[in-house]
Interface confidence: low
């Protein structure tokens, strides 16, 4: 009867440089001796090498010399007594590319190389990119832990070195950027900037990296009010805007934040639960009335806080002249003059180019003036 030597292993395996691969394998061999049980030794060799002299790439025989370049990286996994010859390859290197064959030895009779079932290993360039994990969402001012890991990598081989780069990192603390984990305290200005994790095996030439854009949540820091595309000056949370009565007014309120804050406009200085007059950042008044001189408030509401700014509206109107009208009365000629404007104008009488102002007397002339606003009256 023909001895049965069988090996089940895939013909070819591809792995990226620096990563790991497990090659499942099972074998059978003839063993019928019930009176002695010599140890079972199995070996993986580079193709073309002579088993008697060559260094092995992996074995369970403690007396056989293993190739220095595969030591610790090529390992037998599983129980060889259960005919498991699975091979684990870690930190794959370009020079590992090639064919490998399996050999079994037990006692004097079993010495067999499974030359008909060779394993072809191809190590290709590393195109796998590391993953950057955010352990919690990024929030401005709150320290957050990030980690960087390479799918398919394992403990075998030289240690991995890490390098983090990005505007959000403190240039004063380079040591923290050399670990697989990073603690980041983002600022509002870090939103949308790039963060890169670069990985490299010590002694290896090739690196791999992943870049992510930071999504930093932050409350509004400032509010700007624009009129016709021009930002209004703001003093102590108040903006002043002179506007002509009857004029149309379109104001835009902007409060940079992430996610975008909810913007609304209120009449006057509102309480927290007041009803807005506009639920967007835009306030449109078709005709400004003098009654609106109390102003408006723009509020930016955000999950991380709110901010508001008061717009003090100074409504002015062009003068409307009534008079002058004169009539003869008992005490003499009485002339009246009225102006409507906001702010209330001051009135002045001229007598032969000489001004008569306020409440005054000059010879037989007497002037009475009042400014209840928006009317100014003088007689």
């Amino acid at each position: 009867e023909k001895p049965v030597y069988e090996l089940q292993v895939q013909k070819s395996v591809t792995v990226q440089e620096g990563l790991c691969v497990l090659v499942p394998c099972s074998f059978s061999y003839p063993w019928r001796s019930w009176y002695s049980s010599p140890p079972l030794y199995v070996y993986w060799f580079r193709d073309g090498e002579i088993p008697y002299y060559a260094e092995v790439v992996a074995t369970n025989n403690p007396d056989r010399r293993v190739k220095p370049e595969t030591q610790g990286r090529f390992r037998l996994l599983g129980d060889v007594q259960k005919k498991n010859c699975s091979l684990s390859i870690g930190d794959a290197r370009m020079e590992d590319t090639g064919s490998y064959f399996f050999r079994v030895e037990r006692g004097r009779d079993v010495k067999y190389s499974y030359q008909q079932n060779k394993l072809n290993l191809e190590v290709t360039a590393l195109i796998e990119k590391p993953d950057i994990h955010f352990l919690e969402p990024l929030e401005s001012g709150r320290p957050t832990r990030l980690s960087c890991s390479l799918p398919g990598s394992c403990e075998a081989g030289p240690p991995l070195t890490f390098s983090w780069t990005g505007n959000a990192l403190s240039p004063l603390d380079p040591e923290t950027t050399r670990s697989s984990e990073l603690t980041l305290t983002p600022r509002p200005e870090d939103h949308g900037t790039n963060l890169t994790c670069q990985m490299k095996r010590q002694g290896a030439q090739v690196t791999t990296e992943r870049t992510v854009q930071l999504n930093v949540s932050y409350a509004p820091q400032t509010i700007t009010i624009f009129r016709n595309g021009i930002a209004l000056e703001i003093l102590q949370n108040t903006s002043y805007l002179p506007v002509l009565e009857g004029q149309a007014l379109r104001l835009l309120c902007d409060a940079p934040s992430n996610p975008p804050a909810h913007l609304s406009w209120f009449q006057g200085s509102p309480a927290l639960n007041a009803t807005p007059i506009s639920n967007t950042g835009i306030l449109e008044l078709r005709r400004v009335r003098s009654a609106e001189k109390g102003g408006f408030t723009c509020r930016a509401q955000h999950p991380l806080g709110f901010l508001q700014i008061f717009l003090n509206l100074s409504v002015y109107s062009l003068p409307q002249l009534l008079g002058p009208s004169c009539s003869w009365e008992a005490e003499g000629l009485h002339c009246r003059c009225s102006f409507r404007a906001w702010p209330a104008p001051s009135l002045c009488w001229r007598l032969e180019e000489k001004p008569l102002e306020g409440n005054s007397s000059q010879g037989s002339f007497k002037v009475n003036s009042s400014s209840p606003g928006p009317w100014a009256n003088s007689s």
Epitope: K67, E69, D96, T97, G98, T124, Q205
Partner: antibody, heavy 118, light 107 residues
Framework: EVQLLESGGGLVQPGGSLRLSCAAS????????LSWVRQAPGKGLEWVSG????????FYADSVKGRFTISRDNSKNTLYLQMNSLRAEDTAVYYC???????????WGQGTLVTVSS | DIQMTQSPSTLSAYVGDRVTITCRAS??????LNWYQQKPGKAPKLLIY???SLQSGVPSRFSGSGSGTDFTLTISSLQPEDFATYYC?????????FGGGTKVEIK
């Protein structure tokens, strides 16, 4: 200064043998994989053979497999190419080159001419 | 083996011209593409590695781009010393293979 310097080229008859050497200086020799790249007269570049930093693993182009042997002596900072059973089509300038980042060849020697002719 | 096809094989240009050389791989090679310059009687010199990274000491008028299978070497303003032969090389998979070369001549 990082440098590679080839030697050993010359005229040899078909079927003959030749050994090329490449002396390295200016860098940590055993950190780097090295290769031989050749260029036939008036032709392009062809990768011939490569060796790992430790010398434990070697690679060959199909056109030279079984005839050429690459080796290195890290104690002498020297790379070798033993060429046997030479053919007329092996005539070329042979360069030794260092593997750099992304497997580029970042440092090259000046080359040595091998002529196979009867 | 991965085939590298370079075009054009010859290119005539004036000093100051913008010059573009293309290289196509027969399969996807990520950015494992390097460019070399070779002058007559001299060894090749590495210009660009990883498709777009400028090798230290190489003038900034040289630039590379591309990923996957299609790659480009650009010389923004050709100088007298740039007249040479240019080769691309893939380093994605063994064996390394080179393009056939592009000779840049003076018009």
């Amino acid at each position: 200064e990082v440098q590679l310097l080839e030697s050993g080229g010359g005229l040899v008859q078909p079927g003959g043998s030749l050994r090329l050497s490449c002396a390295a200086s200016g860098f940590t020799f055993n950190y780097y994989a090295l290769s031989w790249v050749r260029q036939a007269p008036g032709k392009g570049l062809e990768w011939v053979s490569g060796i790992s930093g430790s010398g434990g693993t070697t690679f060959y182009a199909d056109s030279v497999k079984g005839r050429f042997t690459i080796s290195r002596d890290n104690s002498k900072n020297t790379l070798y190419l033993q060429m046997n059973s030479l053919r007329a089509e092996d005539t070329a300038v042979y360069y030794c080159a260092r593997r750099g980042g992304w497997y580029s060849f970042d440092i090259w020697g000046q080359g040595t001419l091998v002529t196979v002719s009867s | 083996d991965i085939q590298m096809t370079q075009s054009p094989s010859t290119l005539s240009a004036y000093v100051g011209d913008r010059v573009t050389i293309t290289c196509r791989a027969s399969q996807i090679i990520s950015t494992y593409l390097n460019w070399y310059q070779q002058k007559p009687g001299k060894a090749p010199k590495l210009l660009i590695y990883s498709a777009s990274s400028l090798q230290s000491g190489v003038p900034s008028r040289f630039s590379g781009s591309g990923s996957g299978t299609d790659f480009t070497l650009t010389i923004s303003s050709l100088q007298p010393e740039d007249f040479a032969t240019y080769y691309c090389q893939q380093s994605f998979s063994a064996p390394d293979t080179f393009g056939g070369g592009t000779k840049v001549e003076i018009k």
